[in-house]
C-alpha cells in the first residue's frame, strides 16, 4: 500500500504529464509492490517557504507497510529527489522525505485492513 | 463561453519595448487555470513562451532569452506579455490560450484569435 | 528540450481516403496532443492525452501511440479535414510543438 505525498510550490501548469503516471512505476519497482497498490497525491500550488525562500521545494511523505529503513529509505531519497529535479526542477537541498512504516492493522483499504 | 482576446501595438521598431495584452471573458484568470502566451512565426513554428497560473505564478520557456515577462491585472481579467528589446525575430503572431488538466495531463483548450507583431525599423 | 518530427509536412488525399499523421519525438513523453489549424485562424484543441477527442471533433479522427511515436488518424477523409495538424507535448520542459503537417484534400 505504498502512498507517497508531495506537497510542493510549483504551479500545476509546471506538472508535466504523466507525472503521476511515472511516479507509481517508479514507486512500484522501488518497494518491489505491485502498481496497483500505488498510491500517489501531488499537491502543487502551495504556499511553501523552505530555508525562508519561496524558489521551488517539496515536503513529502512516503508511508509502506515494511519496506521502510536506513538503507532502503536512502535509495528511496535518490529516486525521488532525482524525479522531483528532473520533472518539476526542484533542487534536491530543497526537498524533504519523511518515511513511515505503518503496521498492518492500523491501514485500512477495502472495507477491512491488511492485517 | 470562454474567449480570450488578444491586443498590441502592431508594428514596433527594434530595440523597442512593448506590451501584448489578453482580455478573457467567460472564465476568471484567478480560478483553476493557466494562462499562456505562445507565438507562431511566419513559417508557421509554434514556441511556446510561458504562463501566469491563477495563483499568480509565473513559468518561462528557459530555452529563450529572459527578455519577456508575464504579469496580470484581475480586476480586468487580463493578462500581459512584456517584451523587451524587441529584434525583427521577435515578429510573430502572438497567442494567448487556456491550460485546462485532465488526469495526469494538461493541454490548451481556448486560444485567441492572435495579434500580429511586425518588428521593423 | 524534446524535439518533435512530424511527417509527413505535406500529404494530400481524396475525399474518402484513410489519413495517418505521424509525430516523432527525440526522447519518449508520455502524452501527445494535437491541434488543428485553418489559414487565418487560430489552432484548436482535436486531440489530448493521445487519444481523446476534444469537443465537437468528428468520430472519425483518431490518436495513438506511445514513448517517441504517435499518430493522428482521420478514417475517411473528408474536405473540412484540410488544415495544417501539430503536435505538442508536455511531458518534459519546455513544452515543445512539432513543425506542422499540412493536409489537402485531392
Known amino acids: 500500500m505504498p502512498m507517497f505525498i508531495v506537497n510542493t510550490n510549483v504551479p500545476r501548469a509546471s506538472v508535466p504529464d504523466g507525472f503521476l503516471s511515472e511516479l507509481t512505476q517508479q514507486l512500484a519497482q522501488a518497494t518491489g509492490k505491485p502498481p496497483q497498490y500505488i498510491a500517489v497525491h501531488v499537491v502543487p500550488d502551495q504556499l511553501m517557504a523552505f530555508g525562508g525562500s519561496s524558489e521551488p521545494c517539496a515536503l513529502c511523505s512516503l508511508h509502506s507497510i515494511g519496506k521502510i529503513g536506513g538503507a532502503q529509505n536512502r535509495s528511496y531519497s535518490k529516486l525521488l529527489c532525482g524525479l522531483l529535479a528532473e520533472r518539476l526542477r526542484i533542487s534536491p537541498d530543497r526537498v524533504y522525505i519523511n518515511y513511515y512504516d505503518m503496521n498492518a492493522a492500523n491501514v485500512g483499504w477495502n472495507n477491512s485492513t491488511f492485517a | 463561453d470562454v474567449q480570450l482576446q488578444e491586443s498590441g501595438p502592431g508594428l514596433v521598431k527594434p530595440s523597442q519595448s512593448l506590451s501584448l495584452t489578453c482580455t478573457v471573458t467567460g472564465s476568471s484568470i484567478t480560478s483553476d487555470y493557466a494562462w499562456h502566451w505562445i507565438r507562431q512565426f511566419p513559417g508557421n513554428k509554434l514556441e511556446w513562451m510561458g504562463y501566469i497560473s491563477f495563483s499568480g505564478s509565473t513559468g518561462y520557456n528557459p530555452s529563450l532569452k529572459s527578455r519577456f515577462s508575464i504579469t496580470r491585472d484581475t480586476s480586468k481579467n487580463q493578462f500581459f506579455l512584456q517584451l523587451n528589446s524587441v529584434t525583427t525575430e521577435d515578429t510573430a503572431t502572438y497567442y494567448c490560450?487556456?491550460?485546462?488538466?485532465?488526469?495526469?495531463?494538461?493541454?490548451?483548450?481556448?486560444w485567441g484569435q492572435g495579434t500580429t507583431l511586425t518588428v521593423s525599423s | 528540450q524534446i524535439v518533435l518530427t512530424q511527417s509527413p509536412a505535406i500529404m494530400s488525399a481524396f475525399p474518402g481516403e484513410k489519413v495517418t499523421i505521424t509525430c516523432s519525438a527525440s526522447?519518449?513523453?508520455?502524452?501527445m496532443h494535437w491541434f488543428q489549424q485553418k489559414p487565418g485562424t487560430s489552432p484548436k484543441l482535436w486531440i489530448y492525452g493521445t487519444s481523446n477527442l476534444a469537443s465537437g471533433v468528428p468520430v472519425r479522427f483518431s490518436g495513438s501511440g506511445s514513448g517517441t511515436s504517435y499518430s493522428l488518424t482521420i478514417s475517411r477523409m473528408e474536405a473540412e479535414d484540410a488544415a495544417t495538424y501539430y503536435c505538442q507535448q508536455r511531458s518534459s520542459y519546455p513544452w515543445t510543438f512539432g513543425g506542422g503537417t499540412k493536409l489537402e484534400i485531392k
Open positions: 526522447s519518449s513523453v508520455s502524452y
Open positions: 490560450a487556456r491550460e485546462a488538466y485532465g488526469y495526469d495531463v494538461g493541454y490548451f483548450d481556448y
